[in-house]
Structures are given as C-alpha cells and as structure tokens.
C-alpha cells in the first residue's frame, strides 16, 4: 500500500533506533538516577533467624543471594531482559506515569538439600528447588 | 544425637509455623502498608508512541499488560512465589534493612506476531517471544 511504501522510505530518513539512541543519550547523560544497576548481591540466611532451627537439622543456613538494582532505560544486554521488559522500560522512559520500571529479579535459581524433621519427627532429606539465586535480570 | 532429639521434642511445643503465624497476624493487622498486592494490570502499547511506526507495519500496537503491586509477608499461594521469594519475604519482614521485598514480575509471558520492514525494506513476519504478560508473581 502507499502507506507502507511511504513508511518503508521513511526508514532511511528515520532509522528505527534513532529515537531509542536519542533517548539513550539523554538517559546516559542524566545524573538524576545514580542507583546501581540490577545485579546479584550477597545474602546468607540463617535458619535460626527465621525461627526454623527446631525442624531444620542441617544446614544451619545457606548462601541465598538476592537481586537488587535499577532497571532503567537503556537496558544493557547483561541485564537478561525479556522483550516485555524492554518495551516496559521504554514506555516508562517516555511517560513514567504509565507503568513502573521493570524490576530486578532472579533469572536463574538453584536448589539446596535440607535435612529436617517432618510432622511425625521422622528425619527427611529433601531437595528444595529455587532457593539460591544464580543470576538476576530485568523483568 | 542429643541435640537432634531435643530439637525433635521442641517441635511439639513450638510448631515450625508458630513464628510464621505470629508474624502473619502482625502483618495482617498492620495497616501501614495498604498497597495493592502483586497482580497483572492493563497496558496497551502503541508502536507509534515508541517511535516504531516506520518499521512495524502491523499491528499498530498490542495489549502488553504489566505487573505491579506488593510482595509483602505473608505471601499468598496465588502470588506464584518461588521458594527464594518466600525466604526473602521472611528475611525482609524480620529485618527490612537486610534485603528488599521480592518484586512483582511476570511469571508467564506470551509471544506476538509482528509484520515489519527489515533493513533492506523486505516485509518480514516474525514471532516475538515474551511480549505479553500472562501472569505475575513474587520473585
């Protein structure tokens, strides 16, 4: 259609990433948001602190890690962002009222094995899935 | 071992969820945080608004949805929380300084098909993964 042709011709004048690049420059030159980017942080969890010491036999605790940080425009490739997160970041950048920024959350989780007492005081060894953060990303 | 036996006996006096229940009551009776719980919200994205109208032919936009809301203790089952998120919520509840609350993020995403111009102005139909939020949860 003529509309499509016109748009196809427009592309050489307006590359699809021109607006994105313009906004990236604004974002990178803006010092208003100096929060650290989304990444994995250290966290050791003691089962005693959670009040679970009377039913968990071992381990006493574990390195759980956690995710925290900014998911701001432009999202870097190492932020493991989904396509939806990329769109949401752009929508937020254009108009923050519309949506929040995507959030920094685990993208890969590992299991741990726990030795515990069940309700009949039997000792059970069980693998608990998704207990340890392996990687973080913007979602 | 004697320690294990002792802990096993303690369990009948101190059920493993007693502390959790105590904290749940505190949490539920606390009116300090009346934010809506983590859930899926409406979001319609116009490709024109993103500055992509010159390379995306169709659709003009799509219902992307987004996730927003509180991931506070206690996490309900419908919040699709991972084991790590449950632990993190409890750690935050006990000491908010330690870690942030888990964040509300997509747990299921769907694809959309997009008709667009490539860099040689060919018309391409491509399925873009992870573009539409189908469900949200606490991570």
């Amino acid at each position: 259609s003529t509309g499509s042709k016109q748009r196809s011709q427009n592309r050489s004048k307006t590359p699809k990433n021109q607006e994105a690049l313009r906004m990236a420059n604004v974002a990178e030159n803006s010092s208003s948001d100096q929060r650290q980017a989304c990444k994995k942080h250290e966290l050791y969890v003691s089962f005693r602190d959670l009040g679970w010491q009377d039913w968990i036999i071992a381990p006493e605790g574990y390195a759980a890690y956690y995710c925290e940080g900014e998911c701001a425009f432009p999202l870097n490739s190492y932020m493991n962002a989904t396509n939806h997160a990329i769109v949401q970041t752009l929508v937020h950048f254009i108009n923050p009222e519309t949506v929040p920024k995507p959030c920094c959350a685990p993208t890969q989780l590992n299991a741990i094995s726990v030795l515990y007492f069940d309700d009949s005081s039997n000792v059970i060894l069980k693998k608990y899935r998704n207990m340890v953060v392996r990687a973080c990303g913007c979602h | 071992s004697t320690g294990s036996k002792q802990r096993s006996q303690n369990r009948s006096k101190t059920p493993k969820n007693q502390e959790a229940l105590r904290m749940a009551n505190v949490a539920e009776n606390s009116s300090s945080d009346q934010r809506q719980a983590c859930k899926k919200h409406e979001l319609y994205v116009s490709f024109r608004d993103l500055g992509w109208q010159d390379w995306i032919i169709a659709p003009e936009g799509y219902a992307a949805y987004y996730c927003e809301g509180e991931c506070a203790f206690p996490l309900n089952s419908y919040m699709n929380a991972t084991n790590h998120a449950i632990v993190q919520t409890l750690v935050h509840f006990i000491n908010p300084e330690t870690v942030p609350k888990p964040c509300c993020a997509p747990t299921q995403l769907n694809a959309i098909s997009v008709l667009y111009f490539d860099d040689s102005s060919n018309v391409i139909l491509k399925k873009y993964r992870n573009m539409v939020v189908r469900a949200c949860g606490c991570h």
Epitope: V91, I94, N95 | H41, L43, Y44, S46
Partner: nanobody, 130 residues
Framework: EVQLVESGGGLVQAGGSLRLSCAAS????????IGWFRQAPGKEREGISC????????YYADSVTGRFTISSDNANNTVYLQMNSLKPEDTAVYYC???????????????????????WGQGTQVTVSS
C-alpha cells in the same frame, strides 16, 4: 474544550442500586480514558473504576469489584457506572474524569491514579442510608 457532566446521583437505601452517567464532549472519545472517582467527607479522592472506550478495557478498585460495573456508549459519548449492593460507606461525591491516552494510544490504568487525570466534572452526590 473537554467537558464532563455527571448525573444520576441521589439518596438510596443500603442494598439498593444507582446508575451514574457521565456525558462527555469536546474530544474524541476513543482517544481518552474515562474514570470514576469518589470523595467522602474528610477523605482523599479515590479512583474506583476506569474504562478505555476504544477496546473496552476496564479497571475496578478492590472496594467496588463485583458490585460496580463501568460501561461506555461510544455513539453518545457517555460512560455509565452501575452501582449495585450499595453500602453506607459508598456515600460520597462521585466525579467523572478523563485523560488522553498518552500521546497516541499507549495507556495503562495504574490503579486509576488521580494524578493522570486532567479533566474533571462537577460531581454528583450519592448518599446510602442504613
């Protein structure tokens, strides 16, 4: 100029129903989000329901979900709020409000945030007696 006129308020007994109307003019209906807000004496104005008339997307606050229904009549540029099972705590002045989908079509409801809306009606009083 955007104009919004509410009607349909009144006095009703608890458990009863009312239908509020918001007649809109001065803008292209499909390009706007229309919301219903309410303000009880001494309380903040709260967003209770919103609609995008172009695609029928709706939002409801938890306090009215299952009792109130928002709908739009695009031919007549009118938005309705059907209120059933009314409670004394629903007593308030009800306002109709509008905001453009920014700027060509992208929108969300963000819990019908008051800050998003720039055009307001004069309001209509709803009183629910016990």
């Amino acid at each position: 100029e955007v104009q919004l006129v509410e009607s349909g308020g009144g006095l009703v007994q608890a458990g009863g129903s009312l239908r509020l109307s918001c007649a809109a003019s001065g803008f292209t209906f499909d390009d706007y989000i229309i919301g219903w807000f309410r303000q009880a004496p001494g309380k903040e104005r709260e967003g209770i329901s919103c609609i995008s008339s172009s695609d029928g997307s709706t939002y409801y606050a938890d306090s009215v979900t299952g009792r109130f229904t928002i709908s739009s009549d695009n031919a007549n540029n009118t938005v309705y709020l059907q209120m059933n099972s009314l409670k004394p705590e629903d007593t308030a002045v009800y306002y109709c409000a509008a905001h453009a989908k920014w700027p060509y079509g992208t929108y969300s409801f963000r819990r019908c945030r008051r800050a998003s809306f720039d055009s307001w009606g004069q309001g209509t009083q709803v009183t629910v007696s016990s």
